[in-house]
């Protein structure tokens, strides 16, 4: 009874289609599958960025797999053929591993790459990225930003740079159609007549870097002799009400500071008859139902009440 063996996949490689970190891992079937033509061969693929503790593992019947990687580091991957137990009358048979690596040959020393890259998706509408030039680079150095997300045919270059002293130090992006809830890839590379410039790669999801506008139309409503309801409206723009968390800062008579985080556009405050002055501000942030992270908005304009009017039904600024 001869031992059943199977070859590893052929032509295993990592292909960079120019999407700034979204790579294709692809391979060809192993040779000599003649004993198993009635059987679906599977492949176990393992891959990671070099330096990562853990491998990502995929089992697939396909001859390709796509995923995002950090191109600031190298990538390593390995794959072998699996014959399920149904094909071999008992135990699963595995081939030896085929292995491959991929990295972008780095140009320039690390200090030449952009510093303090910061990207904010203002009000879920306008993406703006800014950076500082690399350490010790000359004024002739210019940086260029390229970006890609699934849905674009190819990586695009920024067309509206923010400049300082003739150098590009940021990018105002155009309208980005259907770009949220997917990886957004950025490469900032550079050129200088003096020395090579190191490229930098960044990946994030736009919904996680949203900075909303502050809430508007802050009002007071007397609910009872000892309760005041603070109300406000969601900021104008595309973010639905269900996506907001709010932080309120309330000052009573310039002394007591109350801070609270709420999910709705109202907050009920217990007050005493002695309260002479009440002020509050609100800021907003995209909540966990709509993103994994976010940036607090600026504080709203302050809304204050002073004097005897606190007993009246509604107080508007």
């Amino acid at each position: 009874d001869t031992e059943i063996k199977v070859n590893p996949p052929q032509d295993f490689e990592i292909v960079d289609p120019g999407y700034l970190g979204y790579l294709y891992l692809q391979w060809q079937p192993p040779l000599s599958l003649d004993h198993f033509k009635e059987c679906t061969v599977e492949y176990e693929l393992k891959y990671r960025n070099i330096g990562s503790e853990t491998w990502k593992t995929i089992i697939t019947k396909n001859l390709h797999y796509k995923d995002g990687f950090d191109l600031n580091k190298g990538i390593e991957a390995k794959i072998h053929t699996l014959l399920p137990w149904q094909c071999t009358n008992g135990s699963e048979v595995q081939s030896s591993w085929a292995e491959t690596t991929y990295w972008i040959s780095p140009q320039g020393i690390p200090e030449t790459k952009v510093q303090d890259m910061d990207c904010v998706y203002y009000n879920w509408q306008y993406l703006l990225c800014s950076w500082k030039p690399g350490i010790g680079v000359l004024l002739d150095t210019n940086y260029n930003l390229f970006y890609w997300y699934e849905g674009l045919d190819h990586a695009l270059q920024c067309v509206d740079y923010i400049k300082a002293d003739g150098q590009n130090i940021g990018c105002r992006f155009p309208y980005l159609e259907a770009s949220d809830y997917k990886d957004f890839y950025i490469c900032v590379n550079g050129s200088s007549e003096n020395k090579p410039i190191r490229s930098s790669y960044f990946t994030f999801q736009l919904q996680n870097i949203v900075k909303p506008l502050p809430p508007v139309y802050l009002t007071f409503t007397r609910e009872s002799s000892c309760e005041i309801k603070l109300k406000w409206s969601i900021p104008l723009g595309p973010i639905p009400a269900r996506c907001f968390d709010y932080e309120i800062e309330i000052r009573e008579d310039d002394t007591t500071l109350v801070t609270a985080t709420v999910e709705n556009e109202t907050y009920t405050l217990k007050t005493t008859n002695e309260t002479r002055q009440l002020c509050f501000v609100v800021r907003s942030k995209v909540n966990i139902y709509c993103s994994d992270d976010g940036i607090w908005s600026e504080w709203s304009d302050k809304q204050c009440w002073e004097g005897e009017d606190l007993s009246k039904k509604t107080l508007l600024r």
Epitope: D16, Q28, S32, D34
Partner: antibody
Framework: QVKLVESGAEVVKPGASVKLSCKAS????????MSWVRQAPGQRLEWVAT????????YYPESVKGRFTITRDNSTSTLYLEMRSLRSDDTAVYYC???????????WGQGTLVTVSS | DVVMTQSPLSLPVTLGQPASISCKAS??????VAWFQQRPGQSPRRLIY???YRYSGVPDRFSGSGSGTDFTLKISRVEAEDVGVYYC?????????FGQGTKLEIK
């Protein structure tokens, strides 16, 4: 739709070099291996070279190894075949072909005639 | 190298009648065999892969069979547009090799 368009006909002298190109469209070029196949007048098809999708792997028959080089430029979706030290028996129509995901050749270009003659 | 031997080399067929082409490999090539049609003055066109699977767009009168070393291409009812040379090819091992071709013509 998938389209493969080879460069124009070439007439060269024995010992000379020539570089053929094949422009691909209608599919994700970097995901597919590509091959060159030739056909001498009145003869069977003869495989000349294969390159994997990312260009990491190349294969040649003994008859052209060391003389022919297959390359690709995935940024322009173009396949190349550089032929050096050409001989009269290299005279043929050269086809580029896409390798499908089972390793067969599923789409072929229109062919380009290379004539090696003194 | 794997030698692919086709027979017959010439195949005269009456319109509407069936046709069969044989291809024998000099060693086991599993089911890694493809069939191509080359009409006069044209590039080869894909017909069959993995010995028996028809590519999309190929009329169902074409069928392939076989595994190991013996393979067959059948045309159930020959039509005028089927005239040309038919090639088998193995892609089980490098170098890739083709049969010498079978010329199908109408009687």
């Amino acid at each position: 739709q998938v389209k493969l368009v080879e460069s124009g006909a070439e007439v060269v002298k024995p010992g000379a070099s020539v570089k053929l190109s094949c422009k691909a469209s209608g599919f994700t070029f970097s995901s597919y291996g590509m091959s060159w196949v030739r056909q001498a007048p009145g003869q069977r098809l003869e495989w000349v070279a294969t390159i994997s999708g990312g260009g990491s792997y190349t294969y040649y028959p003994e008859s052209v190894k060391g003389r022919f080089t297959i390359t690709r430029d995935n940024s322009t979706s173009t396949l190349y075949l550089e032929m050096r030290s050409l001989r009269s028996d290299d005279t043929a129509v050269y086809y580029c072909a896409r390798r499908d995901l089972r390793s067969a050749m599923d789409y072929w270009g229109q062919g380009t005639l290379v004539t090696v003659s003194s | 190298d794997v030698v692919m031997t086709q027979s017959p080399l010439s195949l005269p067929v009456t319109l509407g009648q069936p046709a069969s082409i044989s291809c024998k490999a000099s060693q086991n090539v599993d089911i890694n065999v493809a069939w191509f049609q080359q009409r006069p003055g044209q590039s080869p066109r894909r017909l069959i892969y993995s010995a028996s699977y028809r590519y999309s767009g190929v009329p169902d009168r074409f069928s392939g069979s076989g595994s190991g070393t013996d393979f067959t291409l059948k045309i159930s009812r020959v039509e005028a547009e089927d005239v040309g040379v038919y090639y088998c090819q193995q892609y089980n091992a490098y170098p890739l090799t083709f049969g010498q071709g079978t010329k199908l013509e109408i009687k």
